[in-house]
């Protein structure tokens, strides 16, 4: 066994120079992929299909904005020192889609929108901006729309289950639907402080005829029109002593 | 065994130069993938299909905004040091979709929207901004819409189950639906402070005829129009001592 | 040392920065919404000694060092972050900054 | 140390920064919404000895060092973060910063 090991080593030694040169672009990419997952604290790449992405990706201005900002990649003021605590990704914006909520489900037997699940990693005082984006379907005639965002609360003695978060009135003309954003920073911060108070919200956008224009559960051809929360957070990494 | 080791080392030493060149782009990418998952504290890549993504991704301005910001990739305030306690990604924005809530389910037998689940890692004082985004369906005629966001609370003696978070009145014209965002920072912060108070919210957006325009549970073709919470947090990772 | 920039046709044997584009679409990472690809670049070339890899950006084949001493290795001396918009597999789309994803300069260290 | 920049055509053998684009779509990471790809770059080049890999931007073959001593290796000396928008698998889309994802500078260390 010793002689076999010796011969193996000799053969390996003879070809190290070549082996070095054979490293391909492919292996570099693979290493970077692994690094990305690690930096994002992901064990594996999320398993999501292109079809699912097409359905999920909000077809809304904030997404276009993020994508269009991709030409300037560099941080001109970064000194780029290689401290280990600057390894992981920092989150700046979180776009959260509504998820199912047992409480919302039980209110009156049919699914309601919306419940947003938050990670306990989000600290309420790090929230810079939080906006609920809703899509209002096209109207056929000019109309005034009353948008109402209600926060689900535990039923009160008088039966009250909701409390208003925000109301707004806007005019819509026939044509394409429009995206509307509503500031929900305070509500979100409260939810983060008191997660148990996050029971869900209800979104209503009624036209003058009482039709609800808000897309809460996208129908056919309405991929990407779900309501969602756009949360901007500030992330200031602390430095360790050397 | 000592002589075997010595011979192995010698042979390997002869071929280091070649071995160097054999590393491939593929392996770099793989390493980066692993690193990304690690930095995101993910054991594996999230298992999410493209179909799921298409359904989940809010079609709303915050998403477009985030995507369009991708030309500016650098962190101007980052010094880029690589300290070990800054290895993981920092979250800046969390977009949370509503999830199921036992409490919401139990109110009167049918699902209601919305319950947002939050991670205990989110600190209420780190929330910079929190917005509930809702999509208001298109209206056929100009109308005023009253948006109400109610917070679900534990039933009070008088039966009250909801308390208002925010109300707003807005005008809508016929055309496309719109996204509306509602500031829910305070509510979110309260939820984070007292998770047990997060029972869900109800969203109402009634037009002048009482029709609810808010998309709470997207119907066919309404993928991406779910309500969601957009939470921006400030993340200040602690440094480890060396 | 400002670092050398090389390309695939360079004959430079010293530690140098080479272009490398990571194309997420090419390997099916559809969960990354943006960018679809980015220029990562990489370092390659000769230094006196080779060290253990800390980051995958310095992709080394681990071998025993017959001399037993530590030598410098061609690694990134300046790196930049990229912003990324991606699904995190939890009903969320995240826009964040990933540090040290682009090699700006290489050097022996 | 400002580091060397090389590309695939460089003949530089010293520790150098090379371009490397990581394309998430290419390897099916659909959960990353944005970026779909980014420029990670990597360090590669010669240092006296070869050490363990830390970053893929410096792509080395790990081998035993016959001399038994640790030598410096071509690694990133300056790295930057990237922002990423991704699903986290928990009904959330996260936008955040991932540090040290782009190699700005490589060096032997």
């Amino acid at each position: 066994e010793n002689s076999e090991q010796k011969e193996n080593v000799e053969k390996e030694g003879l070809c190290n120079a070549c082996t070095w040169r054979q490293n391909t672009k492919s292996s570099r990419i693979e290493a970077i992929k692994i690094q990305i997952l690690s930096k994002l604290r992901l064990e594996t790449a999320p398993n999501i299909s292109k079809d699912a992405i097409r359905q999920l990706l909000p077809k809304a201005p904030p997404l276009r904005e993020l994508i269009d900002q991709y030409d300037v990649q560099r941080d001109d003021s970064s000194d780029g020192s290689l401290e280990d605590d600057d390894y992981h990704a920092t989150t700046e914006t979180i776009i959260t889609m509504p998820t199912e909520s047992d409480f919302l489900m039980q209110v009156d037997g049919k699914p309601k929108c919306c419940f947003f699940k938050f990670s306990s990693k989000i600290q309420y005082n790090k929230v810079v901006k939080a906006q609920l984006w809703i899509y209002l379907r096209p109207v056929e005639t000019p109309t005034t729309v009353f948008v109402q965002i209600l926060r689900l609360i535990k039923p009160m003695k008088d039966g009250t289950r909701y409390t208003g978060i925000r109301s707004l009135k806007l005019d819509m003309n026939p044509g394409t639907g429009i995206w509307q954003s509503i500031d929900v920073k305070t509500v979100l911060q409260n939810w983060l402080k008191q997660p148990e108070s996050n029971l869900g919200i209800e979104i209503k956008a009624l036209d003058e005829n009482g039709h609800d224009l808000a897309v809460t559960f996208p129908g056919p051809g309405e991929d990407g029109l779900n309501p969602f929360l756009e949360v901007k957070v500030t992330d200031t990494p602390k430095r360790s002593r050397r | 065994e000592n002589s075997e080791q010595k011979e192995n080392v010698e042979k390997e030493g002869l071929c280091n130069a070649c071995t160097w060149r054999q590393n491939t782009k593929s392996s770099r990418i793989e390493a980066i993938k692993i690193q990304i998952l690690s930095k995101l504290r993910l054991e594996t890549a999230p298992n999410i299909s493209k179909d799921a993504i298409r359904q989940l991704l809010p079609k709303a301005p915050p998403l477009r905004e985030l995507i369009d910001q991708y030309d500016v990739q650098r962190d101007d305030s980052s010094d880029g040091s690589l300290e070990d306690d800054d290895y993981h990604a920092t979250t800046e924005t969390i977009i949370t979709m509503p999830t199921e809530s036992d409490f919401l389910m139990q109110v009167d037998g049918k699902p209601k929207c919305c319950f947002f689940k939050f991670s205990s890692k989110i600190q209420y004082n780190k929330v910079v901004k929190a917005q509930l985004w809702i999509y208001l369906r298109p209206v056929e005629t100009p109308t005023t819409v009253f948006v109400q966001i109610l917070r679900l609370i534990k039933p009070m003696k008088d039966g009250t189950r909801y308390t208002g978070i925010r109300s707003l009145k807005l005008d809508m014209n016929p055309g496309t639906g719109i996204w509306q965002s509602i500031d829910v920072k305070t509510v979110l912060q309260n939820w984070l402070k007292q998770p047990e108070s997060n029972l869900g919210i109800e969203i109402k957006a009634l037009d002048e005829n009482g029709h609810d325009l808010a998309v709470t549970f997207p119907g066919p073709g309404e993928d991406g129009l779910n309500p969601f919470l957009e939470v921006k947090v400030t993340d200040t990772p602690k440094r480890s001592r060396r | 040392d400002f670092g050398l920039d090389c390309d695939e046709h360079s004959t430079e044997s010293r530690c140098c920065r080479y272009p490398l584009t990571v194309d997420f679409e090419a390997f099916g990472w559809d969960w990354i919404i943006a960018p679809k690809r980015y220029k990562a670049n990489y370092c390659s070339g000769e230094c006196e000694f080779v060290f253990l890899q800390k980051y995958p950006h310095t992709h080394l084949v681990h071998q025993a060092n017959p001399r037993g001493s530590a030598g410098p290795c061609c690694t990134p001396t300046k790196m930049s972050p990229i912003n990324m918009l991606y699904f995190n597999g939890k009903e969320q789309i995240i826009y964040g900054k990933i540090p040290a994803m682009v090699v700006d300069r290489c050097g022996c260290s | 140390d400002f580091g060397l920049d090389c590309d695939e055509h460089s003949t530089e053998s010293r520790c150098c920064r090379y371009p490397l684009t990581v394309d998430f779509e290419a390897f099916g990471w659909d959960w990353i919404i944005a970026p779909k790809r980014y420029k990670a770059n990597y360090c590669s080049g010669e240092c006296e000895f070869v050490f363990l890999q830390k970053y893929p931007h410096t792509h080395l073959v790990h081998q035993a060092n016959p001399r038994g001593s640790a030598g410096p290796c071509c690694t990133p000396t300056k790295m930057s973060p990237i922002n990423m928008l991704y699903f986290n698998g928990k009904e959330q889309i996260i936008y955040g910063k991932i540090p040290a994802m782009v190699v700005d500078r490589c060096g032997c260390s």
Partner: antibody, heavy 119, light 110 residues
């Protein structure tokens, strides 16, 4: 009524600066992207730039260094400023709601204003 | 720079015929579907016909349809009407704040 209307000088001398205003009604500029597109006489459409709902600006490569886009949400106005005008910049300038090519951007346009660059 | 090429430059057909207009981009549009089609008649601003490559805009007749993905796209008018005489433009988005129009295809009715 949702409308967009461009206004500004009809005639500009070479090397001078062009300032055009897009006045909108029924549109909340804090939620809506506004694009500028131009069309030289007898020619095709040419993208000029965008000011996003969030205030970010994106410009055609040929316009960088010459183009400034701003907005005053309270006045419902978006302003385009282009320096060092040249006769080749003679065109009808349009403002449009949204971003053409993204979602239903470009679903609503102003009537356009013809700007002639001549000495 | 990105180049969007439309073909043919001019299309002359009779009423009731099927019109097929092509748009080819020098690089893939973002998410393979950031592409819209516009119709423009003399003296008028453009009118949105199709977005997301294949989604019919509000109020547009169903004889118009769009298809394609990535770099190659097609606008089809199933049965030409006299009022369809116009110039048609494709517009693509590429991320990074980059957008471009094709040079246009003029459709004439014989």
């Amino acid at each position: 009524q949702v409308t967009l209307k461009e206004s500004g000088p009809v005639l500009v001398k070479p090397t001078e600066t062009l300032t055009l205003t897009c006045t909108v009604s029924g549109i909340d500029l804090s939620h809506t992207d506004i694009s500028w597109v131009r069309q030289a006489p007898g020619k095709g459409l040419e993208w000029v730039g965008i000011i996003s709902y969030a205030g970010s600006k994106y410009k055609a490569s040929w316009a960088k260094g010459r183009l400034t886009i701003s907005k005053d949400t309270s006045k419902n106005q978006v302003v385009l400023t282009m320096t060092n005008m040249d006769p080749v910049d003679t065109a009808t300038y349009y403002c449009a709601r949204g971003v053409p090519a993204y979602s239903h951007g470009g679903d609503l346009w102003g009537q356009g204003t013809l700007v002639t660059v001549s000495s | 720079d990105i180049v969007m090429t439309q073909s043919p430059a001019t299309l002359s057909l009779s009423p009731g015929e099927r019109a097929t207009l092509s748009c080819t981009s020098s690089q893939s549009v973002y998410h393979a579907n950031w592409l819209s089609w516009f119709q423009q008649k003399p003296g008028q601003p453009p009118k949105l016909l199709i977005y997301w490559a294949s989604t019919l805009a509000y109020g547009v007749p169903s004889r118009f349809s769009g298809s394609g993905s990535g770099t190659d796209f097609t606008l089809t008018i199933s049965s030409l009407q006299p009022e369809d005489a116009a110039t048609y433009y494709c517009a693509g988005g590429y991320g990074g704040g980059r957008y471009a129009f094709g040079q246009g295809t003029k459709v004439e009715i014989k």
